[in-house]
Every structure is written in C-alpha cells, then in structure tokens.
Interface confidence: low
C-alpha cells in the first residue's frame, strides 16, 4: 500500500520522497531492500539519503531497485517502499510509456502544463520546454515559474511536452527532464443522445436489380470532441463483417463538424449487383453513444419501369 | 506488440497486439498502428474500431497493409505484405477511447506499446 514507483534517466538527477509522511522532526532511515544494506547520508556519496528524500545525483542504471524507508518517532515507526528505475537515454525522440508522467487535460481557457516532480527539486527558473522534442518557441508559450501556459489552445498543441531544469546541490548542477502528455478538451463541447440525420425511420429506398446501390447512415452526436460515438450498419441486426455478403460492405465516411459545431459521423452501405434477395433484408443504420442507441430501419423496393401508358 | 523481425523485400510479417482489459472496453477503442524511422517523426500506418470493424490506412501502405482484429482476444494484427526497405521501422500500437478522432490522422493516443522492430532487407 505504501510503495511509489519513481524512475529516472541515467546520469540525470532523482530525488524520490519517501512514501509515508511524518513531521520534520522524525528521522528516517532508508534502506536498500534487496540487500538490507544502509544508504548513507553523507552528501559525498552519488547516492545518499536526506531526510524524507532520497538522492540519486546522477542516477545510474544500476540503481535501480527497491528502496525502503522507515519514519521513526518516540511512539511508532512506518514503512514506505519507493521502486526505482532508472533507464538508459533514449537515442531517438521518442519518449517510452513507461517515462510518461501522467497525461494533463487543457482547454482555451486553461492551458496550464505543471513541470512533475520538479518541487523535491532544488531549481531555478526559467524552466526549458519542449513538445516532441522541439524546442517551444514563439509568443504563445510562457514558462511561468513551474508550469507552462499556452496561449490560444488549438487541438494541434496536443502532445508529448517535456520539461527541463538544473538541480543544484552543493554547488554542483544535475540534469533533470519530465515529460508528460497533455490532450485538448473543447471547453464548449457536450454530448446528446444520437440524432439520425439520414436515414429517415423506416424509409423504402428505390433500387434496380443489377446495378449499385448506396445507402447512407448520417448521425450527430454534440458539440466537439465525443467519446466513445458510432454509426453502423447493420444486417438483418447482425454487423457487417459478421453478415458474410462480400457484395455488401460499410465504408467509413467523412468525420464531420459543421459550421454550429455539431461532431457528425458518416458510414456508407455499398451494394454492388443488387439482387432479389437484397429487397428481404433489413437495413438498420444505428448510432450510438455514452447516452444510448438509436435506430433507424430501411427496406428497399424495386425501382418500378416508368409507365409510358397514359 | 510482438511479430516484428526481418523480413527480405517482397515478404510478409504480422504484428499483434494485445491490450488488457475487458472486451467490452477493448471493442470500444479506436487502435492504431504507427511507425517511426530513425530520425523521423512517427507515422500512422493503420487504425481501426474493433467494435465496428471500421479501418484505415495511410497511402502508403493502402493494399499492402491489412488491419485487423480478433474482438475474443482483445488483440489488433496487422498484416503487412509485399514490404519493401522503407517499411524499416519501430512499429508501435496505440489504443485510445475517442471514437471521432479516430483516423489515420490521429496522433494522440492515451495507450502506446513498447513498439517492436520491422527491418526490411533488399
């Protein structure tokens, strides 16, 4: 229950707070749990113990590992575990899930991105940002003490923003980089039960026996961004893919959000060389949210020849 | 993921990957497929919907690259035929529950994979 994972990069600084609390006056005492051994406190030494706070300056792959902690006070001791890893540099831009910070959620009114971890840190502004692995420059960004603020939030700052600063400790100065994912969220966005533009309910589409035929199934589901929204086909109320008539298929349409912002989706039934058989089954365009279903039915007719008699 | 390797040009590897959970959450992800070259950004190749099978792919691997799912697993394959030298790459799955960006032009994902290495030799 009291255990933290903490991780670092080679040769950058980590400081890892000991997972159970107690008053500045308690000493603790940190262990390396798989061989039971002390870690010192001495500040000579490239890993020591300082209070509550753990200090790898610089971290070492060899590090890593399960560190114990012990809060002792004149009544009661605690137990915290803190799992440690440290990685190797990555030689590419990319950043791996397992150095991900947890992901922050901004909108355009707010766009603030804190720095993780840097408050058991000893640094001094301004902070370095970057976004997959640029460099951020221009007006719109601000390093404002331990966060970055972005002006005019748009859906492309989405991404993976690092941050970087200097640890100083005793005069010497350590490398520490954090990097977490930030996602953009309409602020104006919301989410209603599934409006079927297209198909009208039980419409009869006309159709010619031999050629191609088209259906559309048009559905809107809000305003911005939508979690978890759908439009499908479906046969005699099985899908698609699971129908088994390769004359038959679902094409995704175009995703649409309209001039009043209404986030819309489109799927297209292809039929190609319309049989008999066609005109018995039913064609059930379906939407589908976090709110509900909604359903609408199509059968098709025969396209009857135009009547020349008068 | 898992599946990558060598392959000579002109040959064939199939990529899996399999994200935990339950099926109802899995059939509810948009996923995708995306490769990263040394010294490029990262490219989508292919994404879908399990829960209603919809795909896409990238021009560039549109009738070479097959995207597809196995819904009792929870697990997304990607068929990759004919390759070719510029298919080398780290190819990494990514998993996400917003259904209206999904598309081969998304590229925030909340779920990635630890991506697994395609080399194609001519």
């Known amino acids: 229950k009291f255990s933290k994972q903490s991780w670092g990069l080679e040769n950058e600084a980590l400081i890892v707070r000991c997972p159970r609390q107690g008053k500045p006056s308690y000493t603790v005492d940190w262990y390396y749990s798989q061989t039971n051994k002390s870690i010192p406190t001495q500040e000579r030494n490239r890993v020591f113990a300082s209070g509550q706070l753990l200090k790898f300056l610089p971290a070492a792959v060899a590090d890593s590992g399960i560190y114990t902690c012990i809060v002792r006070s004149p009544t009661f001791n605690r137990t915290g575990y803190a799992n440690v890893t440290i990685y190797k540099k990555q030689s590419d831009c990319n950043v791996p899930d397992y150095l991900m910070y947890s992901t922050v959620s901004g909108s355009e009114k707010n766009s603030k991105i804190y720095c993780p971890t840097i408050d058991l840190y000893n640094w001094t502004a301004p902070l370095e940002w970057f976004k997959n692995c640029q460099a951020l420059q221009g007006s719109r960004y601000r390093a404002h003490k331990s966060f970055l603020v972005i002006d005019n939030v748009m859906t492309e700052d989405a991404g993976d923003y690092t941050c970087k600063f200097i640890h100083n400790e005793n005069g010497a100065n350590y490398s520490v980089t954090a990097t977490r994912s930030f996602t953009v969220k309409d602020e104006q966005g919301f989410s209603l039960f599934p409006v079927i533009g297209a198909p009208a309910q039980n419409e009869i589409k006309e159709v010619e026996i031999g050629k191609n035929a088209n259906l559309t199934c048009s559905a809107c589901f809000g305003k911005g961004t939508q979690f978890l929204a759908a439009v499908l086909w479906q046969l005699n109320g099985t899908k698609i893919t699971d129908f088994g008539e390769p004359r038959i298929q679902q094409e995704e349409g175009q995703n649409q959000s309209f001039s009043n912002g209404l986030a819309c989706l489109d799927m297209v039934l292809r039929i190609a060389d319309v049989k008999e058989e066609d005109l018995l089954l039913q064609y059930d365009c379906l939407a589908l949210n976090l709110h509900g279903l909604r359903r609408h039915t199509v059968r098709l007719s025969r396209k009857n020849p135009i009547d020349h008699h008068s | 993921e898992s599946g990558g390797g060598s392959a000579q040009a002109g040959g064939s590897l199939r990529l899996s990957c399999t994200a935990s959970?339950?099926?109802?959450?899995?059939?509810?992800?948009?996923m995708g497929w995306f490769r990263q070259a040394p010294g490029t950004g990262r490219e989508a190749v292919a994404t879908s919907y399990p829960g209603i099978g919809s795909t896409y792919y990238a021009d560039s691997v549109k009738g070479r690259f097959t995207i597809s799912q196995d819904n009792a697993k929870n697990t997304m394959y990607l068929q990759m035929n004919s390759l070719k030298p510029e298919d080398t790459a780290m190819y990494y799955c990514a998993a996400d529950a917003t259904w209206n960006t999904c598309g081969i032009t998304k590229t925030t994902y909340a779920y990635w994979g630890q991506g697994t290495q395609v080399t194609v030799s001519s």
């Open positions: 959970g339950s099926g109802y959450f899995y059939s509810r992800l948009c």
